[in-house]
Interface confidence: low
């Protein structure tokens, strides 16, 4: 399939001009190669009319030009002084006319409508509003005002000042008579239909001295705006329908066969299953405008999209609409990355996120798509050191491996982490990508203790068991903080019995903290990686407490002796607190993609009970 894209149909009227934009993948070769516009002949050839190398056919001399915009990957053909002879089939393309790197364009030039003298022409888009102005003289100021539509040979009354409204216009027409100073009345028709098009006559008075004014109303289907996006990338449809529909339900639909337009998303909560996890309808402004973002573009997403406003949340006659023709370029600059990543409860995932490598300094973000209402994507983490409070200790965004890819690691997984996540930056919005995290049956490969309490001034060693399949990987321990996970020295300890099915080849790597201080308290991760590519991780919280005074009872015994409802401020408390921190849905604050960072994001943990086995699948 050719990656060149342009308008399938261009329509104009004799004497007017057209501007035709053709899109191409902006590779180095494409940017510099010849661009052309040619007319297709009956026998299959294509005669060049204008090219980027300076050629202009005699038919186009003085009325056409071709301009290349290499930085955008577009070129534009402007043709003026159109005649009906210009109607025909054309190609815009790159290279040699016959090579197939082209797009077919149909140009249709119509005769202007034959109109009566003194006819005011109103050209209005489908679904919009028209105001027909009707002047009159003083002697007709007190007389009946009316608007007629010419149906066949006869005028049919549409509305008059005595209160009559033609049934075809009920609820969408009014007649306004201006103040006494102005000799003018107006007829306002809303929610214009294609059938409203035609010739109208407004009249003040009914006798031979009446004032008459002819009007020609043309109702046009909006020409689609061309949108050219890369496979796996993102597209944003900005829909501005006007303040008069600010409080009406909005929709985006995709045209299928004939007049059908299948709802993709609407403000009444409907969303097509094919767009689950990869679409957002951004809240509308006071003026009724809104936007829809679709990520993870697929070949089958190409087509014609309409946005509109109607109380039903779908396309109906009289809906004001905007149209787009989306082309999905399969010669994508966006690299393939997994669209589904699987993890087990208590385990972890490492997600690779592509970004435009020209924008290495951009801020990277990761957000969780939520389908409720119109869809939203509250931020969870960014590359500037912000992490949503309830994800502390289990989520990190790393700039590695760099050069067009960053990594997001999420551990302590629960079933509630299943869902769709978006990778994005504050730079090129086309590089938003979607990944689905699925939680599957299984055990985490890395095993760490559920809770660890260190004592001030003492040494702490925390084991991390890993199976033989990771023997060739680099193992590490790191201390988690908002900006990442700082690597620490670790020590290979030899065989371990944690994985009985692994023939003594299961190994452990331990974290050692000498002379523990208060600063050592926090989350630590054990992980495996290959070069700059991260694998699994397991997290453990290290609490730090005072050294016990001589003769005091050991805390671990206190826990065993405690009555069921007695409060024990030891590792058991920390365990419950960890559970709350691990649960990503126990907090109400949200951070939307467009929000500024809220530094006052501290929140209280909700306490709920549960064993450490439920939380992390850790071995003791």
């Amino acid at each position: 399939k050719s990656p060149i894209f342009g308008p399938e149909e261009v329509n104009s009227v004799e004497g007017n001009s057209v501007s035709i934009t053709c899109y191409y993948p902006p590779t180095s070769v494409n940017r510099h190669t010849r661009k052309y516009w040619c007319r297709q002949g009956a026998r299959g050839g294509c005669i060049t009319l204008i090219s980027s190398e300076g050629y202009v056919s005699s038919k186009y001399a003085g009325r056409a030009n071709l301009t290349n915009f290499p930085e955008n990957g577009t070129f534009v053909v402007n043709i003026a002084q159109l005649s009906q002879d210009d109607s025909g089939r054309y190609k815009c393309g790159l290279g040699i006319n016959s090579r197939g790197l082209s797009f077919d364009v149909s140009l249709e030039v119509s005769q202007g409508p034959g109109l009566l003298n003194d006819t005011k022409v109103y050209t209005v888009d489908l679904g919009r509003t028209v105001t027909i102005n009707c002047p009159f003289k003083t002697e007709n100021a007190q007389k009946r005002k009316s608007l007629y539509k010419q149906i066949g040979l006869y005028p049919v009354l549409v509305i008059d000042s005595s209160g009559y409204v033609n049934p075809n216009y009920t609820g969408r027409i009014r007649l306004d008579i201006q103040g006494t100073g102005q000799l003018l009345f107006s007829v306002v028709i809303n929610q214009l239909r294609l059938s409203d098009a035609g010739q109208y006559l407004c009249q003040a008075g009914d006798d031979s001295n009446s004032n008459k004014k002819n009007a020609d109303l043309q109702v046009l289907k909006p020409e689609p705006e061309l949108v050219y996006e890369d496979l796996r990338g993102s597209v944003t449809f900005h829909c501005a329908l006007g303040p008069e529909v600010a409080n009406v339900a909005k929709f985006l639909c995709r045209q299928s066969s004939g007049e059908n337009c299948d709802v993709v998303v609407n403000t009444l909560g409907k969303r097509a299953p094919a767009f689950e996890g990869r679409i957002l309808l951004n809240p509308q402004d006071k003026d009724g405008s809104f936007s829809v973002v679709i990520t993870g573009l697929r070949k089958e997403d190409a087509g014609r999209y309409l946005c509109g406003a109607h109380s039903d949340g779908q396309l109906q006659e009289g809906s004001p609409i905007q149209a787009w023709q989306l082309f999905v370029n399969e010669e994508s600059t966006i690299p393939r990355s997994p669209t589904v990543v699987k993890g087990v409860a208590g385990g972890s995932v490492a997600v690779l996120c592509p970004y435009n490598r020209k924008e290495s300094k951009s801020i990277k973000y990761w957000c969780l798509w939520e389908g409720a209402q119109n869809g939203r994507c509250p931020l969870l983490v960014d590359s500037e050191g912000w992490v949503k409070a309830q994800y502390e200790g289990r989520l990190s965004l790393l700039e590695e491996p760099g050069n067009g890819t960053f990594t997001v690691i999420l551990n302590q997984l629960t079933s509630r982490d299943a869902g769709f996540y978006w990778c994005l930056t504050n730079g090129d919005t086309l590089w938003r990508t979607t990944v689905e995290i699925k939680i599957i049956e299984g055990e985490p490969n890395l095993k760490v203790p559920g809770n660890v309490t260190a004592v001030l001034g003492e040494t702490l060693k925390v084991p991390c068991h890993f199976p033989c399949k990771f023997s060739s990987y680099e193992k590490y321990w790191c201390k988690w903080n908002n900006t990442g996970c700082q690597a620490l020295p670790s020590q290979d300890e030899g065989p371990s019995k944690a994985f009985v099915n692994c023939d003594e080849n299961s190994r452990l790597v331990s974290l050692t903290l000498n002379l523990v201080t208060r600063a050592d308290e926090g989350w630590y991760w054990c992980g495996v990686k290959q070069g700059h590519f991260y694998g699994e991780t397991a997290a453990v919280y290290v609490a730090v407490e005072e050294r016990k005074a001589a003769g005091s009872r050991d805390v671990s015994l206190a826990k065993a002796d405690a009555a069921p409802d007695e409060k024990v401020l030891d590792s058991g408390f920390r365990e419950i607190e960890n559970k709350a921190i691990q649960d990503p849905r126990l907090f109400a604050e949200e951070k939307a993609v467009a929000d500024t960072r809220d530094q006052a994001d501290g929140s209280r943990a909700s306490v709920d009970s549960g064993s450490s086995e439920e939380q992390g699948g850790s071995s003791r």
């Epitope: 149909e9 109607s87 409508p113 066949g152 239909r193 098009a197 035609g198 004939g258 007049e259």
Partner: nanobody, 125 residues
């Protein structure tokens, strides 16, 4: 361009019925964006409007002389428009032309951008 080809004309008796068809071909990538119409031209007379239909068949319009006798329909899946003519009269004798337009306008001033070649209908008394 759009090519319009009419068919179904012929010689019939007064009171009979006839069905004219118009097939659109060529650059008909989105036939449903064209309004369509039928016109006719009797010998020695000007071409006159007969009937029109909008993009999806939601709106139709007829000349007074054919109202109640003629019906225009379209099938966007097949790129065709049809004129069903009942209770034919000798006055209906003419060459019938199919026409397309970029926008729909009811009434006799249909904004034609393409014409067919025409098909002859003769109604004998």
């Amino acid at each position: 361009e759009v090519q319009l080809v009419e068919s179904g004309g012929g010689l019939v008796q007064a009171g009979d019925s006839l069905r004219l068809s118009c097939a659109a071909s060529g650059r008909t990538l989105s036939f449903d964006t064209y309004a369509m119409a039928w016109f006719r031209q009797a010998p020695g007379k000007e071409r006159e409007f007969v009937a029109s239909i909008d993009y999806n068949g939601g709106s139709t319009d007829y000349a007074d002389s054919v109202k109640g006798r003629f019906t225009v329909t379209r099938d966007n899946a097949k790129n065709t428009v049809t004129l069903r003519m009942n209770s034919l009269k000798p006055d209906d004798t003419a060459v019938y032309y199919c026409a397309s337009a970029r926008y729909y306008r009811s009434g006799t001033s249909f904004p034609v951008n393409y014409w067919g070649q025409g098909t002859q209908v003769t109604v004998s008394s």
